[in-house]
Interface confidence: medium
């Protein structure tokens, strides 16, 4: 069987792209739970394209953050706490 690498839990991790020596930029990274269940009939009725299975997921996002200036001349979010919550960003 192929190796399965567990996804690390949602925690603060250093973002090397923006970090400077002595001034780390921390951002929330990792995985959150997702679950799938049969789509309730009442929900099916409202769907344009009906799906038998509904999946529900949360994303690793910042619970709190500060905006800080990084070299290169712009602001980034320096996360101070993480939680699994609403997914704001979706890949198209």
């Amino acid at each position: 069987a192929p190796d399965v690498q567990d996804c690390p839990e949602c925690t603060l991790q250093e973002n090397p792209f923006f970090s400077q020596p002595g001034a780390p930029i921390l951002q929330c990274m990792g995985c959150c739970f997702s679950r799938a269940y049969p789509t309730p009939l009442r929900s099916k009725k409202t769907m344009l394209v009906q799906k038998n299975v509904t999946s529900e997921s949360t994303c690793c996002v910042a619970k709190s953050y500060n905006r800080v200036t990084v070299m290169g001349g712009f602001k980034v979010e320096n996360h101070t706490a993480c939680h699994c919550s609403t997914c704001y960003y979706h890949k198209s």
């Epitope: 400077q20 020596p21 905006r67 070299m71 290169g72 001349g73 712009f74 602001k75």
Partner: antibody
Framework: QVQLQQSGAELMKPGASVKLTASCSGF??????MHWVKQRPEQGLEWIGR????????KYDPKFQGKATITADTSSNTAYLQLSSLTSEDTAVYYC?????????WGQGTTVT | DIQGTQSPASLVVSLGQRATISCRAS??????????VNWYQQKPGQPPKLLIY???NLESGVPARFSGSGSGTDFTLNIHPVEEEDAATYYC?????????FGAGTKLEIS
Amino acid sequence: QVQLQQSGAELMKPGASVKLTASCSGFSIKDTYMHWVKQRPEQGLEWIGRIDPANGNTKYDPKFQGKATITADTSSNTAYLQLSSLTSEDTAVYYCHRFEFAMDYWGQGTTVT
Amino acid sequence: DIQGTQSPASLVVSLGQRATISCRASKSVSASGYSYVNWYQQKPGQPPKLLIYLASNLESGVPARFSGSGSGTDFTLNIHPVEEEDAATYYCQHSRELPLTFGAGTKLEIS
């Protein structure tokens, strides 16, 4: 989507002042810096300065100190560039610029003559 | 202030060939493993468009025929193969510290 809509062309008299406007949409100016860049006819790009709209802090290229004043109004999500004591040297296109790696946006430019 | 010296001032390249533009900073613009040089393309009557950031990173939506390289004080923008739509003026910019400065520009013509 992100847009920086600049005010229209200005025809000015020597010695006058002008205030250029950049109305921003699709993002909050508080979350970024707003830069202004000058381009004289058939010339290159010159960085004038920037503002941190979250607190009003400004930084200027020394050569524009006293000539340019950058302000911002977070309630209307608008950045401003005021130019004073206008001379022929100030004839140029002025661009508002949201400078961020991989999220770089410019206004369409305002011509001041 | 960090000054950027761009060369050549103008360049004529045949369709499908390689265009190479150089930018030399008056002092190092590299720090912590990154080089704070960006490349812009500008066509007449339009604002500049970011092509390359941090010396070698391609901005989203920019064709892969554009590439950037270099570190310290010496940087290069390559376009290969050159297409007709690449006729424009190209500027390097450093963002290592304030004030930000641009190179004088290189006008690229396609023959």
